[in-house]
């Protein structure tokens, strides 16, 4: 049961994380005009990975896409690439993890196959989360560098007669969304990897074990219920021994003392 919960929770957390990475990538507010210590303007500038926007105090908002590819800074291209790689890996990870979920039954898929798929999706989520965190961090570093450069020459002009206010940019909402989303995807991936360990079947190569419980002689052959979904209260999926019933999850997760006779 704990394995199913860990796997399910890992899937949900990763799903939220990847949705957040997609949202952050699409958001326009990666950098926003710094309003602190600046003259009060009737225009607010903000920029995303794909376009820059201007919101006037009149309420009118105008956005312009970056229609050039070669004219863009290499760092911005790198951030775009990292975010897209993160999304692609995350999407593939989600697809793989759906089939790996213990609560979903697909034909006669072996537990070992589900374990491998869970591990694969977990690794994909971890890499996806790291890509998003790296992308956002690179952009944030770029902003910090530009911020202090523009602060150094905040006002430029001819002999101080005519001043030009240089627009400074600070962290936008998308950066925080990206960091949180990347972190969630990373956590989800780790949870999937942990769940994978619990899913891997016991490698015990014995044919049969004789049990002697309550005066009854029961011959028990292990490994006969691999196709079980773990859903519901189907009694034929429960193994009865030593006077108690355990589900398949519990048998795999917590081997009884009789397994080592």
């Amino acid at each position: 049961m704990a394995v199913t919960a860990c796997q399910g929770l890992g899937f949900v957390v990763s799903l939220i994380g990847i949705a957040g990475i997609i949202a952050a990538t699409c958001m326009d507010q990666w950098s926003t005009q710094d309003l602190y210590n600046n003259p009060v303007t009737a225009v607010f500038n903000y920029q995303g990975l794909w376009r820059s926007c201007v919101r006037e105090s009149s309420g009118f908002t105008e956005c312009r896409g970056y229609f050039t590819l070669l004219g863009l800074p290499a760092m911005l291209q790198a951030v775009r690439a990292l975010m897209i790689v993160g999304i692609v890996l995350g999407a593939i990870g989600l697809l793989v993890s759906i089939f790996a979920l213990k609560c979903i039954r697909i034909g006669s898929m072996e537990d070992s196959a589900k374990a491998n798929m869970t591990l694969t999706s977990g690794i994909m989520f971890i890499v996806s989360g790291l890509c998003a965190i790296a992308g956002v961090s690179v952009f944030a570093n770029m902003l910090v560098t530009n911020f202090w450069m523009s602060t150094a020459n905040m006002y430029t002009g001819m002999g101080g007669m005519v001043q030009t206010v240089q627009t400074r940019y600070t962290f936008g909402a998308a950066l925080f969304v990206g960091w949180v989303a990347g972190g969630l995807t990373l956590i989800g991936g780790v949870m999937m990897c942990i769940a994978c360990r619990g899913l891997a079947p016991e490698e015990t190569n014995y044919k049969a074990v004789s049990y002697h419980a309550s005066g009854h002689s029961v011959a028990y052959k292990p490994g006969g219920f691999k196709a079980s979904t773990g859903f519901g209260s189907n009694t034929k999926n429960k193994k009865i021994y030593d006077g108690g019933a355990r589900t398949e999850d519990e048998v795999q997760s917590y081997p009884s003392k009789h397994d080592y006779v």
Partner: antibody, heavy 117, light 113 residues
């Protein structure tokens, strides 16, 4: 057709108060940024105050703390509460709608405020 | 505060002739985000409220005759009336729409010579 009609102007003594109203028809005021602009007799235009989305307000330094811009969405009206009036506040007060480029495209006919003892 | 200085204070031009009014701001009104200049031109006739002519320094408001044109960038701007008509007699104002307070120029009175 868009119409802005100011009212509430008149003669007031220095230190007195007055509340100007701007009733709009043809537009929903709540969806636009609005401004008050004044013009002293025989003088040029002077921006006084603006209210933008989210109820954020801006004021001319000389009226800050004395004037308050507000709007009533239900009545589709804009207001300018003027307290501690001075002789230099004497002017025709116009309300206007902000447009692209923060330009003022629709103006009322104005209401005269005279501050005199 | 941004100081807007118009020149000349008054101008007399013959009908059909070109009229040019200048406006200079103490700080650049060019927004780097959209490369637009936040300068507006208004026309005010006696006893009337101002009328919007040009915004973003060069964009003509709908309904404004094409003889009116705006140009300039940064701190120096110009309003040009290519062929003066009798109805163009008015006071013209430029306005900074970039920095609060949204200051106006002192106005230029245009008359017929």
């Amino acid at each position: 057709e868009v119409q802005l009609v100011e009212s509430g102007g008149g003669l007031v003594q220095p230190g007195g108060s007055l509340r100007l109203s701007c009733a709009a028809s043809g537009i929903t005021l709540s969806t636009y940024a609005m401004s008050w602009v004044r013009q002293a007799p025989g003088k040029g235009l002077e921006w006084v105050s603006s209210i933008i989305s989210g109820g954020i307000t801006y004021y001319l330094d000389s009226v800050k703390g004395r004037f308050t811009i507000s709007r009533d969405n239900a009545k589709n009206s804009l207001y300018l509460q003027m307290n501690s009036l001075r002789a230099e506040d004497t002017a025709v007060y116009y309300c206007a709608r902000k447009y692209h480029g923060n330009a003022l495209d629709y103006w009322g006919q104005g209401t005269l405020v005279t501050v005199s003892s | 505060d941004i100081v807007m200085t118009q020149s000349p204070d008054s101008l007399a031009v013959s009908l059909g002739e070109r009229a040019t009014i200048n406006c200079k701001s103490s700080q650049s009104l060019l927004n780097s985000g959209n490369q637009r200049n936040y300068l507006t031109w208004y026309q005010q006739k006696p006893g009337q409220p101002p009328k919007l002519l040009i915004y973003w320094a060069s964009t003509r408001e709908s309904g404004v005759p094409d003889r009116f044109s705006g140009s300039g960038s940064g701190t120096d701007f110009t309003l040009t009336i290519s062929s003066l008509q009798a109805e163009d007699v008015a006071v013209y104002y430029c306005q900074n729409n970039y920095f609060y307070p949204l200051t106006f120029g002192q106005g230029t009175k245009l008359e017929i010579k």
